[in-house]
């Protein structure tokens, strides 16, 4: 059974490939069963992740879960790296998995890898 | 409660193609990897690959890469894997499953009935 | 790949007996998050494969107590304390750790 413990849906060693200059959505699927918790992201740096603190971030309702998004408008080529998302709830910190934003640079856009081929990296 | 339906069987001749098919309900598959597995008759497991379906990345073992196509319709909850070239060797039973690694040790994995695929002419 | 070998190819045990399967892997499967993804699976006769463990000592819901896994880096071990006839079937160890994910070559469970 699922418990009402405060769950981050991020998959483990997940991929986005993305273009440089285009708007992006990074999503960090929450369930929660009451209260909604406090949401932040993190890029991580090393074995650091660290807090990114003044960035554009909304959340999105929907039936059964919610999404904390953080917002790149537009996408940079140093916004290349992993993010986590982490959740504080009754005083525990839930921490995701990272998830991984390969950035093509606009200039090389024509040499664009395919997804699979990002996929394998 | 999740469950993962496969068609039951599936005859084809040598040199041609087959797509199985895998549907989910009971869990959005978005929110989830999906894997397929070979069980040759009598032997053992062999991980063919798996998708994201929120994205469309894939990753396969390298033996079966060329010869498997893994896709998602989030829409209808299915994954699919499309099996080219068929020979003998093809013959097997083909297991999807679904895999989540989440946060707060919620970790679960579930398993098709599998396609028994024949390959004879 | 990483190679993924279990010992013994079948094990015959009577009823109400232990029985323990190992299961060692050609390189750690300690990965970066300090997690050990490490399954262990039981294909009964006829049906799919059905996860019993997960992260190499976590027991999935349903799963009954008389199961324990452990062991670490490369090195693990599914014991059975008192084995019922329900357990009958092929045992396999899976790790999720490296690309691509792999199996063992399963061991085999009888009822003597």
């Known amino acids: 059974k699922e418990s009402c413990d405060v769950q981050l849906y991020i998959k483990r060693q997940s991929e986005h490939s993305i273009l440089a200059g285009d708007p992006f959505e990074l999503e960090c699927p929450v369930k929660y069963c009451a209260n909604r918790p406090h949401v932040t992201w993190c890029k991580l740096n090393g074995t650091t992740c660290v807090k990114l603190e003044d960035r554009q971030t909304s959340w999105k309702e929907e039936k059964n879960i919610s999404f904390f998004i953080l917002h790149f408008e537009p996408v940079l080529p140093n916004d290349n790296g992993s993010y986590r998302c982490s959740a504080n709830f009754q005083s525990n910190l839930i921490e995701s998995h990272s998830t991984t934003l390969y950035v093509t640079d606009v200039k090389s856009a024509s040499e664009r890898p395919s997804k699979d081929e990002m996929a394998s990296r | 409660e999740v469950q993962l339906q496969q068609s039951v069987a599936e005859l084809v001749r040598p040199g041609a193609s087959v797509k199985l098919s895998c549907t989910a309900s009971g869990f959005n598959i978005k929110n989830t990897y999906m894997h397929w597995v070979k069980q040759r008759p009598e032997q053992g497991l062999e991980w063919i690959g798996r998708?994201?379906?929120?994205?469309?990345?894939?990753k396969y073992a390298p033996k079966f890469q060329g010869k498997a196509t893994i896709t998602a319709d989030t829409s209808s909850n299915t994954a699919y894997l499309q099996l080219s070239s068929l020979t003998s060797e093809d013959t097997a039973i083909y297991y999807c499953?679904?895999?989540?690694?989440?946060?707060?040790?919620?970790?679960?994995?579930?398993w098709g009935q599998g396609t028994t695929l024949t390959v004879s002419s | 790949d990483v190679v993924m070998t279990q010992t013994p190819l079948t094990l015959s045990v009577t009823i109400g007996q232990p029985a323990s399967i190992s299961c060692k892997s050609s390189?750690?499967?300690?990965?970066?998050?300090?997690?050990?993804?490490l399954n262990w699976l039981l294909q009964r006769p006829g049906q799919s494969p059905k996860r019993l463990i997960y992260?190499?000592?976590k027991l999935d819901s349903g799963v009954p107590d008389r199961f324990t896994g452990s062991g670490s880096g490369t090195d693990f071990t599914l014991k059975i304390s008192r084995v019922e006839a329900e357990d009958l079937g092929v045992y396999y160890c899976?790790?999720?750790?490296?690309?691509?994910?792999?199996f063992g070559g399963g061991t085999k469970l009888e009822i003597k």
């Open positions: 998708i994201d379906p929120a994205n469309g990345n894939t």
């Open positions: 992260l190499v000592s």
């Open positions: 899976w790790q999720g750790t490296h690309f691509p994910q792999t």
């Open positions: 390189q750690s499967l300690l990965d970066s998050d300090g997690k050990t993804y």
């Open positions: 499953a679904l895999t989540y690694y989440g946060s707060s040790q919620y970790y679960f994995d579930y």
